[in-house]
């Protein structure tokens, strides 16, 4: 089994181990988001995403998780628990996004819009809330991330 | 292809309320991941962004106007609104309504004239 | 509130290659800031050139094409036709909110 966002194919990645990096800091970071009326990755940011549309968004995603999320997560927090969960997850992801080679012809040009539209509706509600709660709000959303993600592992 | 326009009054008083709404054709404001802006232009000046309403009808506003400025949707019209209140001569502008491409707007109104003025 | 900022003027002869920028006050230009340009005639509304960096809007001539370039946007026009006369603004995604540059005035001569 492997992943299958549409046409970009990672292999090398099993959810089940990136699911048990989250759980081991789940309720830590749930706990500490005193925003639950709003949330980032809404369903209109993941619900109806084509198999082609998919790499695009999940590469986004991904990107803006490694080089905003985790690394500034990083530079705030001291639990080693919690710093080794987060870097499970970042070296899982560094993985994935290493291997999505989203097409730049020309036909797919409305799919990626689209796709980039979806993160930029993601990357506004981050831009909205004050960074250590966007940071924190982003972490308790993983479990949504790799929900979506694991419905393109397939066989 | 998608086509807009604007329409409202085109002269407003100073304190008042400016109320414009932005007819949409050739395309619904809900199909797709489209977001859908407002800007504005004033006399002899260059183009300020105002605000957008994304596809799931959340809001963004620029930080300059965000307490005076309100962008909503009538998706029964296919229309989307602009509300600017206490307006001053300043906000003497043409207004456009557009259809974001990605982030920034992509087919645009063909514009309207407002004037805040006594 | 980011300042976005454009060479005020630029001159181009006909034929030729012009090359405007797009800079952002707080650091560099990236492909995550969505640029974007406008071309605008006098009395007109704007028409949509570029955006998302490079991608060219529909009906746009291949003359006109976006990139970064160092730590600017920039729009690069070649082989400038007298149509091309206008005023150029581009816009970058700052997060949450979008801001235009000031505008730079093209002279085709």
């Known amino acids: 089994q492997e992943f299958h966002f549409g046409p970009c194919q990672v292999k090398g990645v099993v959810p089940q181990k990136l699911w048990e990096a989250f759980w081991a800091v789940k309720d830590t970071m749930q706990a500490q988001d005193n925003i639950t009326s709003a949330r980032l990755l809404q369903q209109e940011v993941l619900q109806n995403v084509s198999d082609a549309e998919s790499c695009y968004l999940v590469h986004t995603l991904l990107e803006f998780y490694l080089k905003t999320v985790f690394k500034n997560y990083h530079n705030r927090t001291v639990e080693v628990r919690t710093l080794k969960s987060f870097s499970t997850l970042a070296n899982n992801f560094v993985l994935i996004v290493s291997q999505l080679q989203p097409s730049q012809e020309n036909e797919m040009f409305s799919i990626r819009d689209s796709a980039h539209r979806r993160f930029l509706l993601f990357r506004r509600a981050f831009k909205q809330l004050d960074v250590e709660a966007a940071l924190t709000k982003a972490l308790g959303e993983v479990d949504i991330l790799l929900t979506w993600m694991q419905k393109f592992y397939k066989l | 292809e998608v086509q807009l326009q604007e329409s409202g009054p085109g002269l407003v008083k100073p304190s008042q309320t400016l109320s414009l709404t932005c007819t949409v054709s050739?395309?619904?404001?809900?199909?797709?991941?489209?977001?859908w802006s407002w800007i504005r232009q004033p006399p002899g000046k260059g183009l300020e962004w105002m605000g957008v309403i994304a596809y799931d009808g959340s809001t963004y506003y620029s930080p300059s106007l965000k307490s005076r400025t309100s962008i909503s949707r009538d998706t029964s019209k296919n229309q989307f609104s602009l509300q600017l209140s206490s307006v001053t001569p300043e906000d003497t502008a043409v207004y456009y309504c557009?259809?974001?491409?990605?982030?920034?707007?992509?087919?645009w109104g063909q514009g309207t004239q407002v004037t805040v003025s006594s | 509130q980011a300042v976005v900022t454009q060479e005020p003027s630029l001159s181009v002869s006909p034929g030729g290659t012009v090359t405007l920028t797009c800079g952002l006050s707080?650091?560099?230009?990236?492909?995550?800031?969505?640029p974007g340009w406008f071309q605008q005639t006098p009395g007109q509304a704007p028409r949509t050139l570029i955006y998302?960096?490079?991608s060219r809007h529909s009906g746009v001539p291949s003359r006109f094409s976006g990139s970064i370039s160092g730590n600017k946007a920039a729009l690069t026009i070649t082989g400038a036709q007298p149509e091309d006369e206008a005023d150029y603004y581009c816009?970058?995604?700052?997060?949450?909110?979008?801001?235009f540059g000031g505008g730079t005035k093209l002279t085709v001569l």
């Open positions: 816009a970058l995604d700052i997060g949450s909110y979008v801001v």
């Open positions: 998302s960096t490079s």
């Open positions: 557009a259809r974001d491409d990605v982030a920034a707007p992509g087919y």
């Open positions: 707080s650091g560099s230009v990236t492909t995550g800031n969505y």
């Open positions: 050739g395309g619904s404001i809900t199909t797709g991941t489209y977001s």
